[in-house]
Interface confidence: medium
């Protein structure tokens, strides 16, 4: 579990980009939004996240989505489908 | 197998820039997000930074910002490392190094042969 | 910048001996820890990944441990052609890093 911390002036992140990887795990807590995150899912793919960076990101996506996530996530998952466990997939409600 | 080819050396003035190449083979090339690294004599290793060879995503450390520049030619399966106002201190091996198949893993799993890169006038 | 620290740059061994290189990072690094083997004038060799994982082909007497800040390379019944430099590597985050590395010599 990541702390909750305030987001360090001038690292609130505008967009979900390649400069993210250089975040410390509780950066990306504090500075990602969650909606910004799930709005930008296709981008994750294309930025070489480490797996306890992944764990952040698939964290704030469980705090915006606690009753599963909506299609529009799903199907932009890409690795991050890679932290998703059982219980998490049978939230999903997929047409 | 899986391959990566570099140029066994180059003598470079100081102030100059070189570009140095690695020649994948043996696998997708487009596939596999490309690393490069330094090393120095006696002084361990160096990430320098990654490029993803098919969408072109570049990250570098922030000690080789202003240093180097990575770029890959799709065509012919090739990395290339910019690196720029050559001093003695870039004087160094530089290898290219493919990360593990798996993403996250970000350790190196294919080494390119290792380009000596000597900076003198 | 996470630092990896291998605190012996030479060890001394024995043919057949066991010998246990280590390798300390700055801070928790969970288990994503490499290993590597490097002869002279050429390029690294992975040895070990995720701490403890061997990589494929190489021998069952290499083997890894450690997690979070501390990490060991074990060589069972080392062999003369093991007498070489070994590096780990930290990518639990962004720059990666490695330790300078650990030369084992002959006794």
């Known amino acids: 579990e990541v702390e909750k911390t305030a987001c360090p002036s001038g690292k609130k992140a505008p967009e979900i980009d390649e400069s993210l990887i250089f975040y410390k795990k509780w950066e990306l807590e504090a500075c990602v939004d969650a909606a910004l995150l799930a709005t930008q899912m296709d981008r994750v793919n294309a930025i070489p996240f480490t797996y306890e960076q992944l764990d952040v990101l698939k964290h704030k996506l469980d705090e915006l989505y606690p009753q599963g996530y909506p299609e529009s996530v799903i199907q932009h998952l890409g690795y991050l489908f890679l932290k998703m466990s059982p219980e998490d997939i049978r939230k999903w409600n997929v047409t | 197998q899986v391959q990566l080819q570099q140029p066994g050396a180059e003598l470079i003035k100081p102030g100059a820039s070189v570009k140095l190449s690695c020649k994948a083979s043996?696998?997708?090339?487009?596939?596999?997000?490309m690393h490069w690294v330094k090393q120095r004599p006696g002084q361990g290793l160096e990430w320098i930074g990654i490029?993803?060879?098919?969408?072109?995503?570049?990250n570098y450390n922030e000690r080789f910002k202003s240093k180097a520049t990575l770029t890959v030619d799709k065509s012919s399966s090739t990395a290339y490392m910019q690196l720029s106002s050559l001093t003695s201190e870039d004087s160094a091996v530089y290898y290219c190094?493919?990360?593990?198949?798996?993403?996250?893993?970000?350790?190196?799993?294919?080494w390119g042969t290792g380009t000596t890169v000597t900076v003198s006038s | 910048d996470i630092v990896m620290t291998q605190s012996h740059r030479f060890m001394s061994t024995s043919v057949g001996d066991r010998v246990s290189i280590t390798c300390k990072a700055s801070q928790d690094v969970g288990t994503s820890v490499a290993w590597y083997q490097q002869k002279p004038g050429q390029s690294p060799k992975l040895l070990i990944y995720?701490?403890?994982t061997q990589h494929t082909g190489v021998p069952d007497r290499f083997t890894g441990s450690g997690s979070g800040t501390d990490f060991t390379l074990t060589i069972n019944n080392v062999q003369s052609e093991d007498l070489l430099d070994y590096f780990c590597q930290q990518y639990s985050s962004y720059p990666l890093t490695f330790g300078a590395g650990t030369k084992l010599e002959l006794k």
């Open positions: 190094a493919r990360r593990s198949s798996n993403y996250g893993d970000w350790y190196f799993d294919v």
């Open positions: 995720w701490a403890s």
């Open positions: 043996g696998y997708t090339f487009t596939s596999y997000w």
């Open positions: 490029i993803h060879p098919n969408i072109g995503s570049t």
